[in-house]
Interface confidence: medium
């Protein structure tokens, strides 16, 4: 394995990131900030690339299948969380001329830097980005119900994952901004409804008088639908992330109709100041029953990385979040304020995750410059346990009843202890008979002076395609040294996040 020039492998890095994004089933498209390190190895006529990519989440859902550089800037009227990441990627190309780059594996760590970048200590308007998004499922359900009333073709859609939740509080009120994915769950699987995936952004505004989040003063929701027929049928997907299941590329994602414009849509979005200061939600009661159970039909997707898995996954692809809302809530009296405005404008029994405007207590203590705040060693084994190559904790989408067989394909590969993989309702182990490729770990938000912990690099060995010795692993251990001509330059427009990345790697 030899170091290579970071700028020389830019085409491969860009392509690899596109393939990673197209592999992912939840979250937001990664955009390339810079190539932090690059090595390559030549085995016969195959080139193996070992890349370290610094990325930032866009505001585009991965479901859009857009090319990462085609994602438009976020709506300036909505708070946009700034989430950075770093990915270690192993990719191969069969011959020098071939454009058939394949991603063999990838490990990413991501973290929000919104609070660390916030300079609002003295501002009366407070923005919170909540890590525990699942608690806002009720609000997503309410918003989707409104959307269904105005769009008949959404009748059989259900909320899948709550991706981001932001709250803006000011003197005029409170706005909750909820992003969530949806899935079509038709009663009858044949003929299959073409619009299987969707992504919605809901803005809910509350008066101070509101005692709960059941009745927003104003609710604005917009949804996009992504047609899987635009993507190839992947029932026979190849085992690696290469051309054959390029889901139609970035030009071919579509939305139903020119983006939906329901009655309360973005034309009359919220005014420049946020609305009334409203209450936080009660803990989610997890009542997600929407009528009788659906017949078990063919799932709309099979996992991208393996064709022999018995059950489809539309889910986490290893995305995990630390559970670090350790707030005690046992001191709440069960007293209700009926027909009475709570002086804080909040229901007295609501719970919140952390606030992001000031330097809150870091869940793992304060770790100043250069240290890895979450106890992650920059290289080698994950200190908390095995890497989740086989997703024992997988999402059943909102449509899928859990399988009867609860066996595992490989044990000991759940989330590391103390980590919580983000899951929707009714989650449990999902059997697999093959290894899932790639993982994304969501770490707690970074504070000023902290840097993003590096993703682990203990990838399992793999045989290269077309190799004489298919049983002999051909990948080398992921390089620990940094290439001399790396890191590359940060792409323009992202200077403020550069401080959160390590500039050099351990030699």
């Amino acid at each position: 394995v030899s170091p290579t020039d970071c700028s020389a492998v830019e085409p491969e890095a860009e392509k690899a990131l596109d393939l990673i994004n197209k592999r992912r089933r939840d979250g937001y498209l990664f955009q390339l900030l810079r190539i932090a390190d690059a090595h390559l190895d030549r085995v016969e006529n195959t080139t193996v690339y070992y890349l370290v990519l610094d990325v930032q989440e866009s505001d585009c859902s991965v479901l859009s299948r857009k090319y990462w550089n085609d994602c438009e800037p976020p709506d300036s009227r909505r708070p946009s969380e700034i989430v950075i990441g770093q990915c270690k990627v192993i990719a191969t190309r069969h011959s020098h001329e071939s454009q058939d780059l394949r991603v063999i594996d990838f490990n990413c760590t991501t973290s929000s830097v919104s609070s660390a970048l916030a300079n609002t200590k003295d501002s009366p308007v407070l923005i919170d980005f909540f890590e525990d998004t699942e608690r806002y499922r009720k609000q997503a359900n309410k918003a989707l119900e409104k959307y269904k009333e105005e769009n008949d073709d959404f009748a059989s859609f259900r909320v899948d994952r709550i991706e981001r939740v932001a709250r803006v509080r000011g003197g005029e009120g409170t706005g909750y901004f909820v992003d969530f994915s949806v899935r079509n769950c038709p009663r009858h699987h044949f003929p299959r409804h073409p619009n299987v995936f969707g992504f919605c952004r809901a803005d809910l505004f509350y008066d101070v008088e509101a005692l709960d989040l059941e009745s927003p003063k104003n609710l604005v929701i917009n949804c996009e639908v992504f047609d899987p027929q635009e993507h190839e049928n992947i029932n026979g997907v190849p085992p690696h992330l290469g051309h054959p299941f390029h889901w139609g590329g970035h030009e071919r994602s579509s939305t139903t109709k020119p983006p939906f414009k329901p009655h309360g849509s973005r034309d009359h979005h919220h005014p420049h100041k946020p609305h009334e200061h409203g209450p936080p939600p009660p803990p989610d009661e997890r009542d997600h029953s929407h009528g009788p159970p659906l017949p078990q039909g063919p799932p709309p997707l099979l996992p991208m990385s393996c064709s022999s898995c018995q059950h489809a996954t539309f889910g986490t692809n290893g995305a995990q979040r630390h559970s670090h809302n350790n707030n005690s809530s046992d001191l709440h009296p069960h007293k209700h304020h009926s027909h009475e405005q709570h002086p804080h404008g909040h229901h007295p029994h609501a719970h919140h995750p952390h606030e992001h405007d000031t330097h809150r207590q870091h869940p793992h203590g304060h770790h100043p410059h250069g240290h890895h705040p979450h106890g992650h060693h920059p290289h080698g084994h994950h200190p908390h346990g095995h890497h989740p190559h086989c997703h024992d904790f997988q999402d059943y989408g909102p449509c899928d009843p859990p399988p009867h067989n609860q066996g595992h394909c490989c044990h000991g590969h759940g989330p590391p202890p103390g980590h919580l993989r983000r899951r929707g309702p009714g989650k449990g182990p999902r059997p697999f008979h093959c290894r899932q490729i790639g993982s994304v770990y969501r770490l707690p938000p970074l504070r000023k002076g902290e840097v993003l912990p590096l993703p682990e690099a203990n990838f399992p060995s793999f045989p290269l395609p077309h190799h004489k010795h298919p049983l002999k692993p051909d990948n080398q251990p992921f390089p620990q040294s940094v290439s001399e001509s790396c890191p590359g330059k940060f792409k323009s427009g992202f200077p403020q996040v550069s401080m959160f990345f390590t500039h050099t790697f351990p030699k």
């Epitope: 003295d122 009366p124 407070l126 509080r169 003197g171 005029e172 200061h277 936080p280 707030n327 005690s328 809530s329 046992d330 001191l331 709440h332 009296p333 007293k335 002086p343 804080h344 404008g345 909040h346 007295p348 029994h349 609501a350 719970h351 919140h352 995750p353 952390h354 606030e355 405007d357 000031t358 330097h359 809150r360 207590q361």
Partner: antibody, heavy 119, light 106 residues
């Protein structure tokens, strides 16, 4: 209903530390809001001292930053004020109060406790 | 720091009167102006927040208005129980209070 109650010594000697406790009932201090200390000097002037938020983050009045510390005990649903190196100028009635967030407005107040700094 | 000035430190009025107490900020505070009532026993109560929003349980005879740097609290029909000292407070930046206006009965 949220109720706050201050407690602590009513007399402190100069150069020593002033320590007060605010006990909150009817609401968990880790659920939401900012939990503040405000004092009122003889002659009625009110001064905001600082807060500890539900998440544990703190913010202090710059004029007191070198002397003040606000901490909490979530198991007892209490938050605390410590003011070091006090002088007779720190004689005041000390109030704890909760704010909807930060200090935009103080919705609930304790009844106040008078602290006299005197030799 | 933003200075808050209540020019009238004490005010005498008769029961049933309409009373207005004013407060001025040294700079624009974007409507983050709140009014508190402190009774003679020292208890403090929030009456009005964000310039004009009446807190639940506060009688409707209290009202607030203003913008920019100039704000006022009005009691439309003075009652005996309104005898107290009234403070304004800005919450646009680190909070500061006015010096208070003591309301007495003529």
């Amino acid at each position: 209903e949220v109720q706050l109650q201050e407690s602590g010594p009513g007399l402190v000697k100069p150069s020593q530390s002033l320590s007060l406790t605010c006990t909150v009932t009817g609401y968990s201090i880790t659920s939401d809001y900012a939990w503040n200390w405000i004092r009122q000097f003889p002659g009625n002037k009110l001064e905001w001292m600082g807060y500890i938020s539900y998440s544990g983050s703190t913010s202090y009045n710059p004029s007191l930053k070198s002397r003040i510390s606000i901490t909490r005990d979530t198991s007892k649903n209490q938050f605390f004020l410590q003011l070091n190196s006090v002088t007779t100028e720190d004689t005041a009635t000390y109030y704890c109060a909760s704010a909807s967030y930060r200090y935009a407005w103080f919705a609930y107040w304790g009844q106040g406790t008078l602290v006299t700094v005197s030799a | 720091d933003i200075q808050m000035t209540q020019t009238t430190s004490s005010l005498s009025a008769s029961l049933g009167d309409r009373v207005t107490i004013s407060c001025r900020a040294s700079q624009d505070i974007s409507n983050y102006l709140n009014w508190y009532q402190q009774k003679p026993d020292g208890t403090v109560k929030l009456l009005i927040y964000y310039t004009s929003r009446l807190l639940s349980g506060v009688p409707s005879r209290f009202s607030g208005s203003g913008s920019g740097t100039d704000y006022s609290l009005t009691i439309s029909n003075l009652e005996q129980e309104d005898i107290a000292t009234y403070f304004c407070q800005q919450g646009n930046t680190l909070p500061t209070f006015g010096g208070g206006t003591k309301l007495e009965i003529k």
